[in-house]
């Protein structure tokens, strides 16, 4: 689900699940700004004080990262010039479970959308030849 | 075949206007922004301008901005550049190239003389 | 607008050389940086994206290094497909800018 609007622009995420100890990937996209300087991307979740993660004027920031994610978070920033702003979340914990917010700036306006993380032991399909 | 293949270059005028197209295949256009870039004769590469996928973004550089306009229709698989009050200096070789992380398609170009 | 400029603006070489061309921004444009290669007549190719990422169906003995302003091409055994004009561009900004180009010709 995303938003869209005048003076808004529309960001669109995935709902997804993370395997605990392995990494994963929270998605977001957006129409990409050519304009690299002007790309803010601020992933927030519900409860915690801190951010996520932050990226702005084509670096990370995290100098208001949240502690429980110190160490554990980036984004693709080869990638933020075609509209990903995926985040990255290493060693998955089951305290990673919840809703994520994908706060995005561009020169045109801001937008966001809300995803759900579900964290588990989830075991890979079996596939009986 | 991922293809871009530019067209609408010729012989104009100072003052005239033409109309260029850049007709893309091969890949999924309405999901890439898309840049205009020119080369005049013996010289360097020189960025004119960008869009974004849906056309949210536009972009011009200073030497063409209010005579220049960008545009895409993503129902036609097709880039536009449209030059008007032309100059003997926007004569050059004009090129469309897909935005990824680089240019990383480009056109054959597309010649504009602009000349009395 | 953010300055970029290449040296040299020409240089000889001969087949096997290791080949090395700068490009410095006029301020940090992070790793957002491009190399493109340009034959006469032809349209440019990218060569390297995001200042050392190998472009798809580009030979490795091209690389990339650098961030910030400071940037570098390599080409690690010059082949004869080589001798060509080569651009950097950055695109962490508008108005997007090219540098001036090199020129690498056969000694």
């Known amino acids: 689900f995303g938003i869209s609007g005048r003076h808004s622009i529309t960001v669109t995420t995935v709902a997804s699940a993370g395997n605990i100890g392995e990494d994963g990937i929270l998605s977001c996209t957006f129409e990409p700004d050519i304009k690299l300087s002007d790309i803010v991307i601020q992933w927030l979740k519900e409860g915690v004080l801190g951010l996520v993660h932050e990226f702005k004027e084509g670096k990370d920031e995290l100098s208001e990262q949240d502690e429980m994610f110190r160490g554990r978070t980036a984004v693709f920033a080869d990638q933020v010039i075609v509209g990903n702003a995926s985040l990255r979340l290493k060693n998955v914990q089951l305290t990673d479970a919840g809703t994520y917010k994908c706060y995005i700036i561009t020169s045109k306006g801001k937008g966001n959308a809300n995803l759900e993380y579900k964290t588990g032991a989830f075991s890979m399909p079996e596939v009986n030849v | 075949e991922v293809q871009l293949l530019e067209s609408g270059g010729g012989l104009v005028q100072p003052g005239g206007s033409l109309r260029l197209s850049c007709a893309a295949s091969g890949f999924t256009f309405s999901s890439y922004g898309m840049h205009w870039v020119r080369q005049a004769p013996g010289k360097g590469l020189e960025w004119v301008a960008s869009?974004?996928?849906?056309?949210?973004?536009?972009y011009y550089a200073d030497s063409v901005k209010g005579r220049f306009t960008i545009s895409r229709d993503n129902s036609k698989n097709t880039l536009y550049l449209q030059m008007n009050s032309l100059r003997a200096e926007d004569t050059a070789v004009y090129y469309c190239?897909?935005?990824?992380?680089?240019?990383?398609?480009w056109g054959q170009g597309t010649t504009v003389t602009v000349s009395s | 607008d953010i300055q970029m400029t290449q040296s040299p603006s020409s240089l000889s070489a001969s087949v096997g050389d290791r080949v090395t061309i700068t490009c410095r921004a006029s301020q940090s444009i992070r790793s957002y940086l491009n190399w493109y290669q340009q034959k006469p007549g032809k349209a440019p190719k990218l060569l390297i994206y995001?200042?050392?990422s190998l472009q798809s169906g580009v030979p490795s003995r091209f690389s990339g290094s650098g961030s910030g302003t400071d940037f570098t091409l390599t080409i690690s055994s010059l082949q004869p497909e080589d001798f060509a004009t080569y651009y950097c561009?950055?695109?962490?900004?508008?108005?997007?800018?090219f540098g001036q180009g090199t020129k690498v010709e056969i000694k």
């Open positions: 190239a897909r935005a990824s992380s680089g240019m990383d398609v």
């Open positions: 561009q950055q695109y962490y900004s508008t108005p997007l800018t």
């Open positions: 869009i974004s996928s849906s056309s949210g973004y536009i």
């Open positions: 995001y200042a050392s």
